[in-house]
């Protein structure tokens, strides 16, 4: 570490005194103090002297030695007071610039270590500090004003009482600057826009920053638009707007819209798109296929997008039959807006119960008219099985109607023994009825089939069978032939409730 | 409809000032520039400066700077241009012209002509 | 300042027939940050206030017949009317407003033969 000499670590001394400053190091050294006049600086290897022999108020300050080959980069320091009685403060700098919340150090250095008992700040023309401006003071370096504010930019002055009168130092501006954390915040209202040619329309871009210095501009494809800029401060932020009025919007305002905003830190842009177009128009469409299927007891929900300019005057849920004339309850409707121009209108359907199958109509109205969107609802149903004896052309014949939707395939077995159902090892014989006869077919209904299995001889000690199934389910209906007659047997899973 | 409509005709001595109005309607006043434009008898048209009528923000042609001044009210949605310290070559008609956003001037008042002479 | 030249200072055409009318600036009017180029013509009818026909180059103003057309680049612009009519008769100018101070051209005076 280097020495110096005089080794005090302060030295007071009269204006025109001569002053001599010596480091020694073990290597080169260099001297580093306040930029003043008088000094001459004579190096010789190893040591270095500054000196003058005329002191000034100016020389005031603190000076270090540092020996830059010094890996351990050690220094050493001693302060020079030159007690002047007429300039009880050096000034090292007269502007000072700090960011918010940083210390700010305003550097009047005392030239007298006697005055520190009577230093104060104070703003230019004798004014006080702001309110909770928090400082300290330092005879070495000066005032410190700690976490410095924006509003407490303004001319200071440090004063000294001498013989009992504030002498003062020349002015210091402290201009402390607002943290910028980034480019200008934007909104551009709205964020899309459409208008009949010849209406009316409005576009907003703003931005604002903790900092006046930013630039906003509003761009139309690739132009920048002229527009008187609105400029505002409030909650400490300073705001910029700029408002596109168009009395009669026409094909060429379409486009894209970009509110871009600068500051410093860099830019922000955010787009919108307006569409003009010729008339109102009303769009209805849906993801879901208009013909749906589903199985009786579950729920359903249809949903209808729509697609509207100007906004609806009125939309509605309509069942449009055929079973009865109940309504969808509103309670069921819901409506959900996706953003000014596109809403989704969804009907719930729990539990859908036989009388619930047909047509549902989405209905909306706006100046462009009526648009109506229908789905049709078939609901699915697991067969319901019968089977009776009856003679046909004079031959007994085994007739089985099947009721269900899908529509029902039919199989026949033969087993052997009494029994509710045929299981595999009692089956003797399976004839499938690839075409069964198709009784009923009505949009919406079960489809009634019917199958007929000619049998010469019932044997007695054996069992009929019809089995229908389809996508949903399967049912069936067991046939036991007695002596005194026919027997029927309807599985017990056939009591079915939908 | 967009209308700008401009005071009447003065006659003005040399070494005063007059002062030309521009009322609009039927648009956003403080949305749109308002600039100033002069045409001498017989001449060709010459560019004085704008206005910003929300802040009253000002720019002027050198060639009229310190004699003229531009300023609006938007309570009326009115907006002015004086020249002082009038010269004979200053008799012409005056038109105020609102800018388009998109930059062109597509509304013109009617003119108002000043006549200097002593 | 822009300067703006017109040619020629007077044209007289025959109705139904085309004219063209010229306009030169002292620097170019294209704006290199988005691509447009900053000029417009205005008709001066008769008695009246000046009335917009084509802005930025090329684009017609609301209900301007399609018998008038801009084009041009950089320095060198036209405007051009491809059957005159008896209505078209005025000054015709072309401003800049790249930069201010806007400036206009002399002016080009059509008229009926």
């Known amino acids: 570490i280097p020495v110096i000499e005089p080794s005090v670590p302060e030295l007071v001394v009269k204006p025109g005194a001569t002053v001599t400053l010596r480091c020694v190091g073990n290597g080169s050294v260099e001297w580093d103090g306040p930029p003043s006049p008088h000094w001459t600086l004579y190096s010789d290897g190893s040591s270095s002297i500054l000196s003058t022999n005329n002191a000034t108020f100016q020389n005031t300050g603190t000076y270090r030695c540092t020996e830059p080959g010094d890996p351990l980069g050690g220094s050493a320091a001693i302060h020079l007071y030159v007690k002047d009685p007429a300039r009880p403060w050096n000034v090292l700098a007269q502007e000072v610039v700090v960011f918010e919340d940083q210390d700010a150090l305003l550097p009047c250095l005392l030239t007298d270590p006697v005055l520190e008992a009577g230093v104060s700040l104070v703003r230019v023309r004798g004014r006080p500090l702001m309110r909770h401006t928090n400082y300290s003071f330092s005879p070495w370096h000066g005032f410190t004003i700690h976490r410095a504010k924006f509003i407490q930019s303004q001319d200071y002055q440090c004063s000294a009482l001498m013989g009992g009168r504030k002498v003062m130092s020349i002015s210091i501006r402290l201009k402390v600057q607002k943290v910028i954390p980034g480019p200008p915040a934007l909104t551009l209202v709205p964020a899309e826009l459409v208008r009949i040619r010849g209406e009316a329309a409005q576009i907003v871009c703003s931005a604002s920053s903790v900092d006046v210095n930013f630039d906003v501009f509003l761009q139309h494809n690739n132009t920048k638009l002229a527009i008187p800029q609105q400029s505002d401060f409030h909650n400490n932020r300073y705001q910029k707007v700029l408002t596109l009025n168009l009395d009669q919007v026409d094909f060429q305002h379409a486009g894209n819209y970009s509110c871009v905003a600068s500051n410093v830190q860099g830019k922000h842009s955010t787009s919108m798109f307006f569409r003009v177009v010729e008339s109102a128009y009303l769009n209805l469409s849906s993801e879901q296929n208009l013909i749906q299927e589903v199985t009786v007891g579950e729920g359903l929900n249809l949903k209808v997008m729509v697609e509207a300019y100007p906004g609806l005057q009125g939309f509605n849920w309509t069942y449009l039959g055929p079973f009865s004339d109940h309504q969808p309850e509103p309670k069921l409707a819901n409506a959900t807006t996706k953003d000014t121009y596109r809403h989704t209108f969804t009907l719930s359907l729990p539990r859908l119960k036989p009388s619930e199958a047909g047509r549902y109509s989405f209905l909306a109205r706006n100046p462009g008219g009526w648009r109506a969107l229908t789905f049709e609802l078939t609901l699915r149903y697991p067969p319901e099985v019968s089977v009776i004896w009856t003679f046909i052309n004079g031959s007994g014949t085994l007739l089985c109607a099947a009721s269900g939707y899908p529509q029902p395939n039919v199989t026949w077995l033969q087993c052997s023994g009494h029994t509710d159902r045929c299981d595999e090892a009692q089956v003797l014989q399976v004839w499938d009825d690839p075409y069964p006869e198709v009784l009923s077919q009505e949009p919406f209904h079960k489809v009634t089939v019917q199958s007929l299995l000619t049998v010469e001889t019932l044997e007695h000690n054996q069992t009929y069978e019809c089995r229908a199934h389809n996508s949903v389910g399967s049912g069936s209906w067991a046939f036991i032939p007695i002596s005194a007659g026919a027997h029927t047997h309807p599985p017990d899973e056939f009591l079915f409730t939908p | 409809q967009v209308q700008l409509v401009q005071s009447g005709a003065e006659v003005k001595k040399p070494g005063a000032s007059v002062k030309v109005s521009c009322k609009a309607s039927?648009?956003?006043?403080?949305?749109?520039?308002m600039h100033w434009v002069r045409q001498a008898p017989g001449q060709g048209l010459e560019w004085m400066g704008r206005?910003?009528?929300?802040?009253?923000?000002?720019y002027y042609a050198q060639k009229f700077q310190g004699r003229v001044t531009m300023t609006r009210d938007t309570s009326i949605s009115t907006a002015y241009v004086e020249l002082s310290r009038l010269r004979s070559d200053d008799t012409a008609v005056y038109y105020c012209a609102r800018k388009n956003p998109w930059g062109h001037f597509d509304y013109w008042g009617q003119g108002t002509l000043v006549t200097v002479s002593s | 300042d822009i300067v703006m030249t017109q040619t020629p200072l007077s044209l007289p055409v025959t109705p139904g027939e085309p004219a063209s009318i010229s306009c030169r600036s002292s620097q170019s009017l294209l704006d290199s940050d988005d691509g447009n180029t900053y000029l417009d013509w205005y008709l001066q009818k008769p008695g009246q206030s000046p009335q917009l026909l084509i802005y930025?180059?090329?684009y017609r103003a609301s209900g301007v017949p399609d018998r008038f057309s801009g084009s041009g680049s950089g320095t060198d612009f036209t405007l051009k009317i491809s059957r005159v009519e008896a209505e078209d008769v005025g000054v015709y100018y072309c401003?800049?407003?790249?930069?201010?101070?806007?400036?206009f051209g002399q002016g080009t005076k059509l008229e009926i033969k």
């Open positions: 206005i910003n009528p929300n802040s009253g923000g000002t």
């Open positions: 930025t180059l090329s």
């Open positions: 039927g648009y956003t006043f403080t949305g749109y520039y």
């Open positions: 401003m800049q407003r790249i930069e201010f101070p806007y400036t």
